[in-house]
């Protein structure tokens, strides 16, 4: 560089007239000449290229061509490069300003609401904050200071579109429409890309997003990009919005969401978007552990430390609201590691969406959309090979968690891929290595990150993980403004609240319940039924007379066995009564002639071997149910396929006597052979493991009738289409609810705080193919089939009408917690 | 098909009272917003104000001093309240459906004369 | 409260011939606008929402554009029946939701 002597281009760059010492100059030509002063390039020439200010710009006389100011007037002129009074007036960096200065709210004026802003960075894995945070200092800031959760669970498939467009509506992809980033209508007989127009047609997008909401509650919405945000949805679009391009540099995008939050009071947004496409394009280049997904990092760190600088710069940085989280993960994929369909058929006559997430339809579309043969293509994909590394679904048999069904847009034919496998058509799909994601949402790769930090959220704080649908009501809630309806549960993330703005309460009952009375302990009907045991009408009327309880023995079992209150009846005019016996209680649906639930808590047994069996070919009718609200024992024998089965195990007896309490038509349900094989291992073992774990669990089981798949119990009517040649429908799925207490000192009765829950949702399916099980005994498939049906109680609550844990002491958000939460038990990234 | 009629009478003294009411016909009242729109002869539109059918309500600031809106479900219909009526209010008073974004469909509109 | 402004107040076009109608706001709208067409003893009659996108039925010689503060309406050859008033009205800022004063397509 040249010699300082030479006089500095300080407060002089691009003056003709200047002449330095030594008659250096500053002018546009010097470098043409060689007589620039020695700052020349630093001053006048990087200046107007960089975002920030540093000790050569501080003062710096007003340049048209830079892409913000360090001049002395430009807090007036409001335009600082962020870190301006950091940089030129020594005050304290937002980064270097310890956590406990931001106590409470501290908005300007005019700022009486505090604005939201919704910052998504494409891509980034949970894993990613933990691994590399010292990379990222800015980010790891926001985590110290704010709130985050140990992730956020994005919403299956673990693609961009869906689960932006999820985040902002707080709708399940199959309710909001953008089921995937690439997808066909049949009704509209078009397809939806990233890369055609046809993605701005309103006809797709479904569902109110948050820009809107706030809209229509007189507030205003400016979106820094986000999927959605450049289509007319109900015929509107946000009051600020700039069309997508990957290529506005992200100094430039927060530099204009800061200009944004300086508008006039009647201009200024209170909600916004800002969108980065990293970290996951480095992630699809090299894959989630590369050195280009580490500079990624370093990139959007920087940038978002800009913004918190920029809102520190405006004394907005306590002010603001701000949620930064991702769409999902990113997991490495392998050449080496692909499913090919030519493998497994002769030709591909079909269309086939290809990757983590694949779908099948038919290749002539529209014509044979409908008549396409998803059954067979199912049939010839399962259990081909035994290191097979997808498993083919019909989407209404997928693990109703996903909710990924009720949508024309969802073909029939999905497979569910292995981690870092990818299922495509044939070997001419070379599009592999690097990174991907779609895949299941409880992989940990692709769990995505959730921070937060403002005047509203708590400080210093970790919260366990919850779902992307969730994050809709709590921006309604930030903005004290009105949801629109949405697949998320109000109120279950009010602990993420200094003072939570919508207080929940337990619904309302429906459906009045009654108790089944004992009128006579001898059946007027025996409903077709046997028990050789049961010799005489004295011995029947013995074992009939346990079922007439008195008011001690009612409240001592309501006690042990419905520790948390029973389950309320939300469905409309459903005619219910409750059973009580000493081991267990049931709500009996009399339309369904079945019960509802049935509740037990099974307590810690010394014992872990398996129960004995149960006294075989024994069944009498319920005398408290009429008989034409009863099944009868003849229906069993009608189907080869069907066989009964019951909600409360008669083996799990305290006395030799009590087996008698279960062994009755008003506890059976009807079952296929086949499910009940698993449902009996379950029971005998597998739920004898977890009382033993837990120190006693509470079970709440019963039947589901989803035969729409649109993941919400069916109307009676629905039921009824799909009764065959008898009396009694055919559940869809089973549910089990197992509670227990966390703390493990404590039995379910007795528990004095949180809950522990293990929810499963499980297809009733005539055979056990999901499992591949020929040959194998209930020991190696039954234990991980069930855990791939695992759920949330708000997912059994949806499919049942019930409601659960009504009598729990515990505030309703803290219920609405443990009823959102979902149990994995993935272990590796 | 969504059909709404507006109901009134056609003269009102000056200093008395507007009102107005729209029967909707062909679906129901429930969610979606319903306004008054009115146009004096020769001229522009203006926008009244709307309710939603729970009952909430926004009106023109410039009227609202003035102006009252109500809903009847169980009616299907919903009703305009303009006190201490001047000759400037005068104009065709229209009912139509609004979902915040535009009005479709409208009633055929109701000739109101404020005479002195 | 926004403003908006239509030109002109009138405008005299043959038939078949082209018309472009003006609407200005007094401060952005981004794309929240929306066109009428009124004929006499008429209520109006939607064209246009979303600044661009044509309501159901409307023939395809009507079309919109613009965005913040500027917006035309285009009719490509006027047709007998398109001679009327047209409006166009904001949604991105309210209450109230406003209108234009109007501009009236008459023959030549």
């Known amino acids: 560089r040249k010699l300082e002597k030479q006089g500095s281009c300080r407060k002089k760059c691009f003056d003709a007239s200047f002449r330095g010492l030594e008659n250096c100059r500053c002018d546009v030509a010097c470098e043409d000449r060689g007589d620039c002063c020695w700052d020349f390039e630093d001053t006048c020439v990087e200046s107007t290229r960089i975002w920030t200010c540093n000790k050569f710009r501080c003062g710096e006389t007003r340049l048209e061509a830079s892409l913000c100011s360090c001049s002395d007037d430009c807090l007036q002129r409001k335009d600082c490069c962020a870190d301006y009074k950091s940089v030129c007036q020594g005050e304290t960096s937002w980064l270097e300003e310890n956590c406990d200065t931001a106590q409470q709210s501290q908005c300007p004026e005019g700022f009486d609401l505090p604005p939201v802003i919704l910052f998504s960075m494409d891509g980034f894995r949970a894993e990613y904050l933990y691994t590399w945070d010292t990379l990222m200092p800015n980010i790891n800031k926001l985590k110290t200071c704010g709130i985050h959760s140990k992730y956020m669970r994005a919403m299956y498939p673990t693609k961009t579109f869906p689960n932006h467009y999820t985040i902002v509506t707080g709708l399940y992809p199959e309710s909001h429409g953008i089921i995937d980033n690439n997808m066909y209508d049949v009704n509209l007989n078009k397809n939806f890309s990233l890369s055609s127009e046809e993605q701005n047609n309103p006809a797709w997008w479904h569902g109110q997003p948050m820009w809107l909401t706030a809209m229509y509650q007189g507030l205003k919405a400016a979106t820094y990009f986000w999927p959605g945000s450049e289509v007319a949805i109900n015929g509107s679009f946000p009051s600020i919005y700039m069309p997508y391009n990957r290529s506005v540099p992200y100094e430039e995008r927060i530099s204009t969401l800061l200009k944004w939050l300086d508008l006039p009071k009647a201009e200024r947004p209170s909600f916004y978007t800002m969108y980065f496409e990293e970290p996951d394009s480095s992630g699809h280049a090299s894959g989630p552990v590369s050195a280009r997904v580490i500079k990624a990092l370093q990139v959007v760190d920087h940038a978002f430390g800009m913004l918190m600088e920029g809102l520190k710069q405006r004394n907005l940085h306590n002010c603001v609201n701000i949620i930064l989280l991702a769409d999902h993960g990113m997991d490495q994929t392998y050449c080496n590691k692909m499913e090919y369909m030519t493998d497994y058929f002769p030709r591909i006559n079909f269309y086939m969406y290809e990757g983590p997430a694949p779908r099948i339809r038919a290749l002539n579309v529209p014509h044979d959309f409908f008549s396409f043969n998803s059954e067979e293509i199912v049939r010839n994909l399962s259990c081909r090979k035994p290191d097979q590394h997808f498993k083919p679904y019909l989407t209404p048999d997928l693990p109703k968690r996903l909710h990924y069904a009720k949508n024309v847009r969802i073909d029939k034919v999905h497979l569910f891929v292995d981690p870092q496998w990818l299922a495509v058509g044939s070997k001419s799909n070379t599009n592999c290595g690097g990174g991907n994601h779609g895949y299941n949402n409880e992989f940990r790769s692709m769990e995505a990150i959730f921070l937060a930090h403002g005047p509203s959220f708590k400080e210093k704080t970790e919260v366990e993980p919850f779902e992307n649908i969730e994050v809709y009501n709590l921006m309604c809630d930030l903005l004290r403004i009105q949801p629109a309806p949405n697949n998320g549960t109000r109120g279950s993330l009010n602990h993420l609240l200094k003072v939570p703005f919508y207080k929940p309460s337990h619904a309302e009952e429906v459906s009045k319940f009654s108790v089944c009375g004992f009128a006579n302990p001898l059946p007027t009907d025996n409903l077709s039924c046997l028990c050789p045991h049961l010799q005489n009408s004295i011995q029947l009327e013995q074992v009939n007379q346990m079922l007439n309880l008195t008011q001690e023995e009612i409240t001592a079992t309501v006690k042990v066995n419905l520790p948390f209150g029973r389950p309320r009846v939300l469905q409309k005019n459903v005619d219910n009564c409750l059973l009580y016996h000493r081991e267990y209680v049931s709500g009996f649906g009399k339309a369904m002639r079945m019960p509802m639930w049935s509740s037990y808590t099974v307590p810690q047994l010394g014992d872990t071997s398996p129960l004995p069996p149960t006294v075989p070919d024994c069944l009498r009718a319920d005398v408290r149910v009429p008989p034409s609200e009863s099944q009868k024992c003849s229906f069993y024998l009608a189907d080869e396929n069907i066989t009964h089965g019951f909600l409360y195990p008669p083996a799990i007896n305290r006395t030799s006597d009590s087996q008698y309490d279960a062994l009755i038509m008003s506890n059976l349900v009807p079952m296929y052979e086949e499910f009940r094989k698993m449902w009996d291992y379950f029971h005998s073992v597998l739920l004898i493991k977890h009382a033993t774990e837990r120190n006693g669990v509470n079970v709440v089981s019963g039947p589901i009738f989803d035969y729409n798949y649109d993941g919400h119990f069916d109307a009676p009517e629905e039921i009824t289409k799909h009764i065959a040649n008898t009396d009694i429908p055919i559940p869809t799925h089973y549910f089990v609810v197992l509670t227990s207490c966390k703390n493990k000192s404590h039995t379910p009765e007795n528990c004095p705080g949180w809950l522990d829950v293990l929810p499963f949702i499980i297809p009733h399916r005539p055979t056990n193919v999901e499992s591949c099980p020929e040959g194998k005994p209930e020991a190696l498939w039954v234990e991980e089939r069930l855990t791939a049906h695992i759920a949330r109680v708000r997912d059994v609550e949806l499919l049942t009408g019930l409601d659960f844990y009504q009598d729990k002491a515990q505030p309703v958000s803290e219920i609405l917690q443990l009823k959102t939460y979902l149990p994995t038990f993935e272990t590796t990234i | 098909q969504v059909q709404l009629q507006e109901s009134g009478p056609g003269l009102v003294k000056t200093s008395e009272t507007l009102s107005l009411t729209c029967t909707v016909s062909g679906g129901s009242i429930s969610s979606h917003y319903w306004s008054w729109i009115r146009q004096p002869p020769g001229k522009g539109l203006e926008w009244i104000g709307n309710?939603?059918?729970?009952?909430?309500?926004n009106y023109n600031p410039s009227l609202k001093s003035r102006v009252t809106m109500s809903v009847d479900t169980s009616k299907n219909h919903f009703s305009l309240k303009l006190i201490s009526v001047t000759t400037a209010d005068t104009a065709i008073y229209y009912c139509?459906?609004?979902?915040?974004?535009?009005?479709?469909?409208w009633g055929q509109g109701t000739l109101v004369t404020v005479s002195s | 409260e926004i403003v908006l402004t239509q030109s002109p107040g009138t405008l005299s076009v043959f038939p078949g011939e082209r018309a472009t109608l003006s609407c200005r706001a007094s401060?952005?709208?981004?794309?929240?606008l929306v066109w009428y067409q009124q004929k006499p003893g008429q209520a109006p009659r939607l064209l246009i929402y979303g600044a661009s996108t044509r309501a159901t039925g409307i023939p395809d010689r009507f079309s919109g554009s613009g965005s913040g503060t500027e917006f035309t309406l285009t009719i490509s050859s006027l047709q007998s029946e398109d001679f009327a008033v047209y409006y166009c009205?904001?949604?991105?800022?309210?209450?109230?939701?406003?209108f234009g004063q109007g501009t009236k397509v008459e023959i030549k």
């Open positions: 009205q904001q949604y991105n800022n309210w209450p109230p939701w406003t």
């Open positions: 309710i939603f059918y729970s009952g909430s309500t």
């Open positions: 139509a459906r609004h979902d915040h974004v535009w009005f479709d469909p």
């Open positions: 401060q952005s709208v981004s794309r929240n």
